[in-house]
Amino acid sequence: MALPTARPLLGSCGTPALGSLLFLLFSLGWVQPSRTLAGETGQEAAPLDGVLANPPNISSLSPRQLLGFPCAEVSGLSTERVRELAVALAQKNVKLSTEQLRCLAHRLSEPPEDLDALPLDLLLFLNPDAFSGPQACTRFFSRITKANVDLLPRGAPERQRLLPAALACWGVRGSLLSEADVRALGGLACDLPGRFVAESAEVLLPRLVSCPGPLDQDQQEAARAALQGGGPPYGPPSTWSVSTMDALRGLLPVLGQPIIRSIPQGIVAAWRQRSSRDPSWRQPERTILRPRFRREVEKTACPSGKKAREIDESLIFYKKWELEACVDAALLATQMDRVNAIPFTYEQLDVLKHKLDELYPQGYPESVIQHLGYLFLKMSPEDIRKWNVTSLETLKALLEVNKGHEMSPQVATLIDRFVKGRGQLDKDTLDTLTAFYPGYLCSLSPEELSSVPPSSIWAVRPQDLDTCDPRQLDVLYPKARLAFQNMNGSEYFVKIQSFLGGAPTEDLKALSQQNVSMDLATFMKLRTDAVLPLTVAEVQKLLGPHVEGLKAEERHRPVRDWILRQRQDDLDTLGLGLQGGIPNGYLVLDLSMQEALSGTPCLLGPGPVLTVLALLLASTLA
């Protein structure tokens, strides 16, 4: 039965742009209302006029409906319309013919901005000169790498202009290529002339193996010479094994008799036998879509005799791809303790890290983490956030790697994970952390410091608190007081001294009764608001013989502010010549008291001292 309209089949209306685009497709004959569609639903396709009356959402069209447009009908379209069409075709992943691609490319006159939205293979037909800047060309050729270059025959002008432009873009000078260069060229590597094969055989031969279509004469001769020369990656033909032959399959037609004669005959026979027995090993048809296993041979096949059954220093001679192919991740994990002692390059360590990441996508187990050694420096904070580190030995081992350096984001993340895992910053942890990073404690927020149990305070050395600010000492002091409470006077003072920057007035008053002889450096670190209420007599007792040092500090806080609060008469009793105290007959009002009474906080904040001249006569006082 015929449908009354196409809407149930094609979906509801989309955006005006998409609607008009579809109208365009139909009107130009690019989209044929496919009758085979009815076969899928058991219903006839909608009449054309139904679709035109209700322009549908393009995403509901099947790729089948987007196939088979003649090029002539595109010539009248605006560039913008052609671009819309190209994007739609990409979204639907419609396979287009060479002619259709060429036609679309020709109509995209200016270089498109959104390369990612266009059909991949369309880029092959765009002029690379239009993407001349370093960023533009990199974007362009990064996409080309993924395109099917073999849509274009070797001799096609579009294909011939791509390789020189790509080489220029990637900054290749001369004929020497790196592994990265070959990767960046993608399918274009198959077009590299013989001189590249001769000079870069080690990285290029494994790529040529998977090139569809025969190599040209120049390439064949260079490949033959390189293979006969016996250099890497395959070595002398006399040492080839069955797996070497497997890896070379795409190049076997170029070998020639001299090479074949020097391959051990047993190997050739074994290889032939296997090829005939197993159809999947026969020379594959040169299809445009290359079988996946052939592309991966170069990446994953470990050369014969190179597989590691044990991690040892011989692996430092491996190229990155050999490490990737020949070292089993599980073996690596169990023998991580060896890696640190072996002088791997940073690039090789990258490969080893990659292997561990693949083996442990949820994060490494502690048995591996403990032995990471220098590989730890390769970890990102994101990697470390996946870890569960509970052993202090593990923490120490990793901090050792970073010893002598500033605390890196990795180390900060590691410590954070460790402390969170333990629930609190215990004494042993604090001991360890402050041994490696004396300023560690002062890098924590007051909130984080609140999780430090008093027992941990025993691990803190005076230098560990050097960079702490008053807010941090406010948190640490009560913990220290609790930790040292059972010590006698002089011992207690020695321990509590470096925490006194967080001590309140009443504790300072109590200390002044114990003849502690506080040095000036400690006094200068006390909280100003805790020092101000102290009397001259209390300060004298607190400092003992060090009281003379007040003169040198009289212009600095908290001494300056304290002097302003004292009666000059009292200051004079010290015999130090301290000036700036309150003259006789002056009254001191504390604004913080006034604020408490009025309930209206002062703009200056609590605690400023207001000195009011009362000029009270003696008679009045009497």
Epitope: S241, S243, C302, E310, D312, E313, D337, R338, I342
Partner: antibody, heavy 118, light 111 residues
Framework: EILLQQTGTVLARPGTSVKMSCKAS????????MHWVKQRPGQGLEWIGG????????NYNQKFKDKAKLTAVTSTSTANMELSSLTNEDSAVYYC???????????WGQGTTLTVSS | DIVLTQSPASLAVSLGQRATISCKAS??????????MNWYQQKPGQPPKLLIY???NLESGIPARFSGSGSGTDFTLNIHPVEEEDAATYYC?????????FGGGTKLEVK
């Protein structure tokens, strides 16, 4: 140049113990496994065991587990093998050899000849 | 333990001819695409010397007239053309499984 230097000849009484050494040079001693092999006069080769000096990890042929003890002194790049409860059967040439990736032995010492005789 | 049986126990080959030595394992020595079979040469009064590793890979410094082949349980060492200095005893060794084991040896005489 990679060299494995072994003590030349050792004479011992039955029932006693003997310790032979193998001094390595020309490579990082701690980063390769050192193996030991026994060869009786006119006979084949028998693998005794190996030690990875970097962490003292050892593996033994069960046949020699109670006979041989492998140790390594990293400070002097020396591998040692102690053979206990000696009998005439222990008279042989003992080779130390460097293992590669757990797959093969690329360098061999000159051998220590042990003679057990009363 | 894996038992390696070498044959022949001895052979005499004329100068310039081919010598073929066989080594059969009591079970496969293949693992993950590699054959863990190695060949050594030993001359009187000397330690053995590595010739071939992983069945077919020539150790560096060893002349190309030595070649190895095979997989699974059957392995072959070929020497062609044989030279006078090749007179020695040849041993196969498997490293696929602990304990590593050696063949009984094949004594090659050059005529």
């Amino acid at each position: 140049e990679i060299l494995l230097q072994q003590t030349g000849t050792v004479l011992a009484r039955p029932g006693t113990s003997v310790k032979m050494s193998c001094k390595a040079s020309g490579y990082t001693f701690t980063n390769y496994r050192m193996h030991w092999v026994k060869q009786r006069p006119g006979q084949g080769l028998e693998w005794i065991g190996g030690i990875y000096p970097g962490n003292s990890d050892t593996n033994y042929n069960q046949k020699f587990k109670d006979k041989a003890k492998l140790t390594a002194v990293t400070s002097t790049s020396t591998a040692n093998m102690e053979l206990s409860s000696l009998t005439n059967e222990d008279s042989a040439v003992y080779y130390c050899l460097r293992g590669i990736r757990g797959s093969y032995f690329d360098y061999w010492g000159q051998g220590t000849t042990l003679t057990v005789s009363s | 333990d894996i038992v390696l049986t070498q044959s022949p126990a001895s052979l005499a080959v004329s100068l310039g001819q081919r010598a073929t030595i066989s080594c059969k394992a009591s079970q496969s020595v293949d693992y993950d695409g590699d054959s863990y079979m190695n060949w050594y040469q030993q001359k009187p009064g000397q330690p053995p010397k590595l010739l071939i590793y992983a069945a077919s890979n020539l150790e560096s410094g060893i002349p190309a007239r030595f070649s190895g082949s095979g997989s699974g349980t059957d392995f072959t060492l070929n020497i062609h053309p044989v030279e006078e200095e090749d007179a020695a005893t040849y041993y196969c060794q498997q490293s696929n499984e602990d304990p590593s084991t050696f063949g009984g040896g094949t004594k090659l005489e050059v005529k």
